[in-house]
């Protein structure tokens, strides 16, 4: 039985140029996380941090995609067509997977706050 | 700390069996694949067999299909593979390797950690 | 069957310099690839994996590049450990996961 829920940040939004956290958390199950996968909203693969392995960051994304903190991913030098949903996956054992979205909105202003909140989708 | 402990290796003439066993320890070995991987005597390295978490997928390599078998058994913790109708070929050291993923990622096929072999010699 | 070919077969080099090996594939992995160290009476040690992701606790000096059917690990600044045969190795999705030959790695 799946007893988990994932945290995210929910819906955020950032400066262009800027850079910004996406961050889920899996809480309330023991089971053991074996892959956490990163995914943009045209499902690509940004990066993966295998538990065994480390990160591995997507060749297409390395200038732009750090990994951390945690299990999280630091997105650098943000343009507008990064605007959409990213997915966070979390492959565990015995529990299986686990997904988590968050919604970042990318704007012109530079005026533009940082908003993050935890919250469970 | 991941440990992969082989044994059942030894002296047998050709056309004979062996099974070689690989005791897991130090992880929670039911979800991840897991493989066997031989080295000839001076020679380069060979994959042998591959297995999946649950046991339902098995692969092998053309050059041991219909004489080996890989199995587990995932409430002991252990890794098989059953040799029959043994060549000379097939004397080597026989690595157990742990796969990085799972059924549930997918499997990589490389292998960060592995045991310190058994040696079978096949020679009459 | 994919066969991986690596060059040279020995590489002299002093401690200290830098070391190139080579790896070629007969056709292309993508970056399906990763290297393995091995030293004597040892099992092979995980280096790089997805031809240039270093595995967990690599140092920096090893670093790998290429993609397709040319692949290339690079010691930095080879340290008195780093003396050992090299192996690269093909992973596709489907089997045989092949290697190569090896390359040893040996003190000028």
């Known amino acids: 039985m799946m007893t988990g829920t994932i945290e995210t940040t929910g819906n955020i939004s950032a400066k262009k140029g800027g850079s910004v956290i996406l961050q889920c958390h899996l809480s309330s199950t023991m089971a053991q996380v074996t892959q956490v996968n990163w995914e943009q909203h045209d499902h690509s693969l940004l990066a993966i941090r295998n538990a065994e392995l480390g990160w591995h960051i997507y060749p297409a994304f390395k200038d732009r995609v750090a990994p951390g903190p945690g299990l999280g991913l630091t997105l650098q030098s943000l343009t507008m067509n990064d605007t959409g949903e990213y997915f966070c996956t979390y492959h565990t054992y015995p529990d299986g997977t686990y997904r988590g979205r968050i919604f970042l909105e990318v704007l012109e202003s530079s005026v533009a706050e940082h908003s993050a909140r935890f919250q469970i989708p | 700390e991941v440990q992969l402990l082989e044994s059942g290796g030894g002296l047998v003439q050709p056309g004979g069996s062996l099974r070689l066993s690989c005791a897991a320890s130090?992880?929670?070995?039911?979800?991840?694949?897991m493989s066997w991987v031989r080295q000839a005597p001076g020679k380069g390295l060979e994959w042998v067999s591959a297995?999946?978490?649950?046991?339902?997928?098995?692969w092998h390599a053309d050059s041991v299909k219909g004489r080996f078998t890989i199995s587990r058994d995932n409430s002991k913790n252990t890794l098989y593979l059953q040799m029959n109708s043994l060549r000379a070929e097939d004397t080597a050291v026989y690595y157990c390797?742990?796969?990085?993923?799972?059924?549930?990622?997918?499997?990589?096929?490389?292998?960060?950690?592995w045991g310190q072999g058994t040696l079978v010699t096949v020679s009459s | 069957e994919i066969v991986m070919t690596q060059s040279p077969a020995t590489l002299s080099v002093s401690p200290g310099e830098r070391a190139t090996l080579s790896c070629r594939a007969s056709?292309?992995?993508?970056?399906?690839l990763a290297w393995y160290q091995q030293k004597p009476g040892q099992a092979p040690r995980l280096l790089i994996y997805?031809?240039?992701t270093r595995a967990t606790g690599i140092p920096a000096r090893f670093s790998g590049s290429g993609s397709g059917t040319e692949f290339t690990l690079t010691i930095s600044s080879l340290q008195s450990e780093d003396f050992a045969v090299y192996y690269c190795?093909?992973?596709?999705?489907?089997?045989?996961?092949?290697f190569g030959g090896g390359t040893k790695v040996e003190i000028k």
């Open positions: 390797a742990k796969d990085p993923g799972t059924d549930s990622t997918g499997y990589y096929y490389i292998w960060r950690y």
């Open positions: 130090g992880f929670t070995f039911g979800p991840y694949g």
């Open positions: 297995i999946s978490g649950s046991g339902a997928s098995t």
């Open positions: 056709q292309s992995v993508s970056s399906n």
């Open positions: 997805s031809a240039s």
């Open positions: 190795q093909q992973y596709v999705p489907h089997p045989p996961f092949t």
